[in-house]
């Protein structure tokens, strides 16, 4: 929840849309202090459902660059390197928050926006629809 | 990046930290207008690297609720339902932006923060270290 009191030491907001409009400091604090080796890994290549990463750019959004995963195959890669089409490579998607300039082109005014991004791929057993 | 012009119709900011402190409207706009069938799937169960989801709560964060994936097995599930420990289930992690109340407990003042979340799991071939 987002709103109201007069806490000493808190910035004041007289905006008529308060509590819906808040002040945000864009100096990003990074909680991931130690570099996580797993994150910077090559899972995208080593996965049985490998993926490529594509750069999605939008100057009216913050962050302006988002990397999107696209599965390389419809099927999954077997131990021998061949693709097994009895299994499916599918994107794992997540809803994330971004800041969208609003009004457009304004430098210091944003609105929160939910967007759906593909983060990577996983190998799943297909749903088989039996015909009576 | 975030900055500069004096567009008419844009909110003004006389904040000395400008352009580092901006106004953000928390009425979330949802870009995912059409229901994406892939998103609402049961990949977490059907994957060869299945995962469970855990509800992570932090009232000083916006959003306060984030669902985190944890891989069910160290190995990957084979077609016969058994786990193959020659392969590894690993979490696919993504850095996301959240808003952190700053100063703490302040209702209308936030700082952008990057946190690392596990979105799902994928099955990878392990890295084998050969001893000379």
């Amino acid at each position: 929840g987002i709103a109201i009191p007069r806490n000493s030491g808190c910035p004041n907001s007289e905006d008529k849309n308060f509590p819906r409009t808040v002040m945000v400091n864009l100096n990003i604090h990074n909680r991931n202090t130690s570099t996580n080796p797993k994150r910077s890994s090559d899972y995208y290549n080593r996965s049985t459902s490998p993926w490529n990463l594509h750069r999605n750019e939008d100057p009216e959004r913050y962050p302006s660059v988002i990397w999107e995963a696209k599965c390389r195959h419809l099927g999954c890669v077997k131990a021998d390197g061949n693709v097994d089409y009895h299994m499916n490579s599918v994107p794992i998607q997540q809803e994330i928050l971004v800041l969208r300039r609003e009004p457009r082109h304004c430098p210091n005014s944003f609105r929160l926006e939910k967007i759906l991004v593909s983060v990577g791929c996983t190998c799943v057993t297909p749903i088989v629809h039996h015909v009576a | 990046g975030i900055a500069i012009p004096r567009n008419s119709g844009c909110p003004n900011s006389e904040d000395k930290n400008f352009p580092r402190t901006v106004m953000v409207n928390l009425n979330i706009h949802n870009r995912n207008t059409s229901t994406n069938p892939k998103r609402s799937s049961d990949y977490y169960n059907r994957s060869t690297s299945p995962w469970n989801l855990h509800r992570n709560e932090d009232p000083e964060r916006y959003p306060s609720v984030i669902w985190e994936a944890k891989c069910r097995h160290l190995g990957c599930v084979k077609a016969d339902g058994n786990v193959d420990y020659h392969m590894n289930s690993v979490p696919i992690q993504q850095e996301i932006l959240v808003l952190r109340r700053e100063p703490r407990h302040c209702p209308n003042s936030f700082r952008l923060e990057k946190i690392l979340v596990s979105v799902g799991c994928t099955c990878v071939t392990p890295i084998v270290h050969h001893v000379a």
Partner: antibody, heavy 119, light 107 residues
Framework: QVQLQQSGAELVRPGASVKLSCKAS????????MHWVKQTPVHGLEWIGV????????AYNQKFRDKATLTADKSSTTAYMELSSLTSEDSAVYYC????????????WGQGTTLTVSS | SIVMTQTPKFLLVSAGDRVTITCKAS??????VAWFQHKPGQSPKLLIN???NRYTGVPDRFTGSGYGTDFTFTISTVQSEDLAIYFC?????????FGGGTTLEIK
């Protein structure tokens, strides 16, 4: 418009189990958490737990962990709560409530299901 | 878990009166408090979220205020259709907890 339609009143024997349902309509079922609460004259409203139909995740109030099991069926946009090993203490009105995960609040409630446990 | 103590339990008022209900949290919940109205035979309805934000379509006679541990819900001019049980709820963290409710009766 958003609607949460709960199943009808139940009269069950002690020791038995019961499965209550909550049929959602008017929104994308997979995008919102579904929570369940219990209401009794003695304890008032108590939060039981939550299921996220989109990702299958669940979380429970410790007090109800061994009592309630939450599930959801996306194809029928229905959330379920199964209550096991019923005793008279489980007699109550049970509500399902939609929760906006990002915004962080409950908005729509079902009409409630009255459960009576009696021999 | 956080205890939400709501007072009073009952209110008997006349149409046109001003009504105030309070909720006290056992620890700070920031502004993560909602107020609901539960009319007989209906589902509970959200009136106020974020302690003071009037929910869509809610008449402006209903207002909320407070932060931290002390919260107030006010009906500025009670109308006959406001006969209901009103309760507060914290969504600061699970287990989410509720006030005991205030039954509003119209003379």
């Amino acid at each position: 418009q958003v609607q949460l339609q709960q199943s009808g009143a139940e009269l069950v024997r002690p020791g038995a189990s019961v499965k209550l349902s909550c049929k959602a309509s008017g929104y994308t079922f997979s995008d919102y958490e579904m929570h369940w609460v219990k209401q009794t004259p003695v304890h008032g409203l108590e939060w039981i737990g939550v299921i996220h139909p989109g990702n299958g995740g669940t979380a429970y109030n410790q007090k109800f962990r061994d009592k309630a099991t939450l599930t959801a069926d996306k194809s029928s946009t229905t959330a379920y709560m199964e209550l096991s090993s019923l005793t008279s203490e489980d007699s109550a009105v049970y509500y399902c409530i939609r929760f906006l995960t990002y915004e962080g609040y409950f908005d729509y409630w079902g009409q409630g299901t009255t459960l009576t446990v009696s021999s | 878990s956080i205890v939400m103590t709501q007072t009073p339990k009952f209110l008997l008022v006349s149409a046109g009166d001003r009504v105030t209900i309070t909720c006290k949290a056992s620890q700070s919940v920031n502004n993560d408090v909602a107020w609901f109205q539960h009319k007989p035979g209906q589902s509970p309805k959200l009136l106020i979220n974020y302690a003071s934000n009037r929910y869509t379509g809610v008449p402006d006679r209903f207002t909320g205020s407070g932060y931290g541990t002390d919260f107030t819900f006010t009906i500025s001019t009670v109308q006959s259709e406001d006969l209901a049980i009103y309760f507060c709820q914290q969504d600061y963290g699970s287990p989410y907890t509720f006030g005991g409710g205030t039954t509003l009766e119209i003379k």
